[in-house]
Interface confidence: low
């Protein structure tokens, strides 16, 4: 797959034109470069310890693999080694770089390939067989579950629709937040690039169901998250009556504070 990186192709050309003359008998140049190119192309035939190799990588994995290869190729050419020793060293290096690339690919397949647990993620991948870049849709269940949110009355409600893979996904459009009513109707509350919906100083009327939808270029939503918002009763200060007996030196102006929820009828009256 590293052959898909133009800098690797350039480095191999430079090896042929700039390094081989003066370091290897001219009659071996053609056969040598064929072997080198085959060895580099052979990077696509990987045997991974646990997973089957899928034959695709992302840009970051390709860059990592090619940078590692180029670094070691430079070490060899900088050493000015010649003849059989050069050939031997070069092919050892290519073998070990293939091993290294296999570890990068294994990590990519485990951690970075379709990392979304739900929704649809669009990921640009490089197909090693033909070096083509294509956008791959990682399709999981659209529904990314439900979140229960509790907000004390008069505080800010924040509904966060962002999932860790959203930043890495391509083709995402807008976050839309809907207020969902009991009779299967809904109202669009906000739409835009902001992944959170913030409602300052919530009241009891803000309790209920909300839905977030993240749109994507291929029309189907990338993510759907449902929120169930509970507005907790406001905590108020209430003065306790002072005790009848006042001991000498005791302050009478201070009262102890207890936190009590609003009575239901008071809550209704506040609407």
């Amino acid at each position: 797959c590293v052959i898909c990186d133009p800098s690797v192709v350039l480095a191999l050309k430079s090896l042929e034109k700039d390094y081989l003359p003066g370091h290897l008998d001219a009659k071996h140049h053609k056969a040598m470069m064929e072997r080198v190119e085959n060895a580099v192309k052979d990077f696509q035939e990987l045997s991974l310890n646990e997973d089957a190799y899928m034959g695709v990588v992302d840009e970051a994995t390709l860059q990592k693999g090619s940078w590692s290869l180029l670094k070691d190729l430079k070490r060899i050419t900088d050493s000015d080694v010649k003849g059989d020793l050069f050939v031997k060293e070069l092919f050892w290096m290519l073998h070990l770089q293939k091993e290294t690339f296999a570890t990068y690919v294994a990590r990519f397949q485990k951690e970075a390939y379709c990392p979304n647990k739900c929704g649809v993620m669009l990921q640009t991948l490089i197909w090693c067989k033909n070096c083509k870049k294509e956008v791959h849709a990682c399709r999981k269940s659209y529904d990314c579950g439900e979140r229960n949110v509790e907000v004390p009355q008069m505080e800010d409600m924040i509904l966060d629709c962002e999932l860790n893979w959203h930043q890495a996904s391509e083709g995402l459009t807008d976050y839309s937040f809907y207020r969902v009513w009991g009779n299967n109707t809904e109202t669009l509350v906000s739409k835009g690039k902001e992944a959170t919906l913030t409602k300052p100083m919530v009241g009891p009327e803000d309790a209920g169901s909300y839905r977030c939808e993240l749109g994507s270029v291929n029309s189907s939503p990338a993510t759907i998250i449902n929120f169930h918002v509970t507005v907790l009763p406001k905590m108020i200060k209430e003065e306790k009556p002072s005790p009848n007996i006042v001991t000498p030196g005791e302050a009478t102006t201070e009262s102890s504070i207890s936190l009590q929820p609003l009575q239901p009828e008071k809550m209704l009256a506040s609407r």
């Epitope: 070691d72 070490r75 060899i76 050493s79 080694v81 020793l85 031997k88 060293e89 050892w92 290096m93 073998h95 070990l96």
Partner: nanobody, 117 residues
Framework: QVQLVESGGGLVQPGGSLRLSCAAS????????MTWVRQAPGKALEWVSS?????????YYSDTVKGRFTISRDNTKNMLYLQMNSLKPEDTAVYYC?????????RGQGTQVTVSS
């Protein structure tokens, strides 16, 4: 014929260090890459580190040991070394040195490394 004799293994506590040695004979040591591989009980053979020839040898390490192990060679003495620092229980295995860079090349009898408290 090729002879490789490993030594330096033993029992060590987690976080400790060991230095493995491999005495090579029966081939031109300075003309070959050398490799350390290991095999934990019931597990497959695992590549640990290789060293090539140039400039005293270019080292390569597996991700599991990178930053903790150091491979080196002394061509004048036909010796290969593996300095193992910050050892972990999962480093427990029989360690073999091998001629060349593949784990299926000729290798020695191995030396047991046990990391345990």
């Amino acid at each position: 014929q090729v002879q490789l004799v490993e030594s330096g293994g033993g029992l060590v506590q987690p976080g400790g260090s060991l230095r493995l040695s491999c005495a090579a004979s029966g081939f031109t040591f300075s003309n070959d890459a050398m490799t350390w591989v290991r095999q934990a009980p019931g597990k497959a053979l695992e590549w640990v580190s290789s060293i090539t020839l140039l400039g005293g040898g270019i080292p390569y390490y597996s991700d599991t040991v990178k930053g903790r192990f150091t491979i080196s060679r002394d061509n004048t003495k036909n010796m290969l070394y593996l300095q193992m620092n910050s050892l972990k229980p999962e480093d427990t295995a029989v360690y073999y040195c091998a001629k060349g860079f593949k784990s299926d090349y000729p290798r020695g009898q191995g030396t047991q490394v046990t990391v345990s408290s």
